[in-house]
């Protein structure tokens, strides 16, 4: 379970994103260039500092709109 305002790194960060984002998924893999502002951002915020639920949710993917 997610514990608010803590440092999250490695697999624990990935698992927490999966928990928070659920079926929406999240921005995980970098593109072929291996550069991703999103990926770098969540690492800086959540592993090297600490992050809360609201920040984690900003990395969840937006579900495709159904027609």
């Amino acid at each position: 379970a997610y514990r608010p305002s803590e440092t999250l790194c490695g697999g624990e960060l990935v698992d927490t994103l999966q928990f928070v984002c659920g079926d929406r998924g999240f921005y995980f893999s970098r593109p072929a260039s291996r550069v991703s502002r999103r990926s770098r951002g969540i690492v800086e915020e959540c592993c090297f500092r600490s992050c809360d639920l609201a920040l984690l949710e900003t990395y969840c993917a937006t579900p495709a709109k159904s027609e």
């Epitope: 490695g10 770098r40 690492v43 592993c47």
Partner: antibody
Framework: EVQLLESGGGLVQPGGSLRLSCAAS???????IMWWVRQAPGKGLEWVS?????????LYADSVKGRFTISRDNSKNTLYLQMNSLRAEDTAVYYC???????????????WGQGTMVTVSS | DIQMTQSPSSLSASVGDRVTITCRAS??????LNWYQQKPGKAPKLLIY???TLQSGVPSRFSGSGSGTDFTLTISSLQPEDFATYYC?????????FGQGTKVEIK
């Protein structure tokens, strides 16, 4: 060829300082999280420190916190480890390594340097 | 901190043998377990990450399995170049910790 090359090791007295360098080549250094890992003679591997790709974030093992400082110069493709207040128990081969994943170590360390020996003794 | 315990600490085997090394975590680490091979005087080499994914360029005789707290590295048919020390490492969270190593020696 993707390569990491450490330098700066040597013999230092307890309480002394050393600065290790790790020169990267063959890949876009600024895109990767980087690590220092050490291995005392005849012993296992121990994580020392990690730095984010931009250099804006750092973490340290409790055993070196407050004494060691990790940094990087992306314009020079070089990783550093400043080691102060050295102790006998810091004697080890120090390796730099490249992160294999996206979220700080979750896929291990895929490229390692050859290591540089640090001996702390009077 | 998460403690990693490998067994056995050493083993003797012959070329062609099937070799199994186990690694146990002191708490659940999901599948965030990596395996390295180290030869004397050399740097470690990543073999397997996230428990079962073979690193690029690593021979298919190496395989990994497990989840939670119990993990296994298997060498299906030991080759002369496989005599080395093998380390497991948890990558679930900080501090990133390694097992004490398993030395695979020639019988």
């Amino acid at each position: 060829e993707v390569q990491l090359l450490e330098s700066g090791g040597g013999l230092v007295q307890p309480g002394g300082s050393l600065r290790l360098s790790c020169a990267a080549s063959g890949f876009t250094f600024s895109n990767y999280i980087m690590w220092w890992v050490r291995q005392a003679p005849g012993k296992g591997l121990e994580w020392v420190s990690v730095i984010s790709s931009s250099g804006g974030g750092t973490l340290y093992a409790d055993s070196v916190k407050g004494r060691f400082t990790i940094s990087r110069d992306n314009s020079k493709n070089t990783l550093y480890l400043q080691m102060n207040s050295l102790r006998a128990e810091d004697t080890a081969v120090y390796y730099c390594a490249r992160d294999n994943g996206d979220y700080v170590g979750e896929k291990g360390f895929d490229i390692w340097g050859q290591g540089t020996m640090v001996t702390v003794s009077s | 901190d998460i403690q990693m315990t490998q067994s056995p600490s050493s083993l003797s085997a012959s070329v062609g043998d099937r070799v199994t090394i186990t690694c146990r975590a002191s708490q659940s680490i999901s599948n965030y377990l990596n395996w390295y091979q180290q030869k004397p005087g050399k740097a470690p080499k990543l073999l397997i990450y996230t428990a079962s994914t073979l690193q690029s360029g690593v021979p298919s005789r190496f395989s990994g399995s497990g989840s939670g707290t119990d993990f296994t590295l298997t060498i299906s048919s030991l080759q002369p170049e496989d005599f080395a020390t093998y380390y497991c490492q948890q990558s679930y969270n900080s501090p990133w910790t390694f097992g004490q190593g398993t030395k695979v020696e020639i019988k």
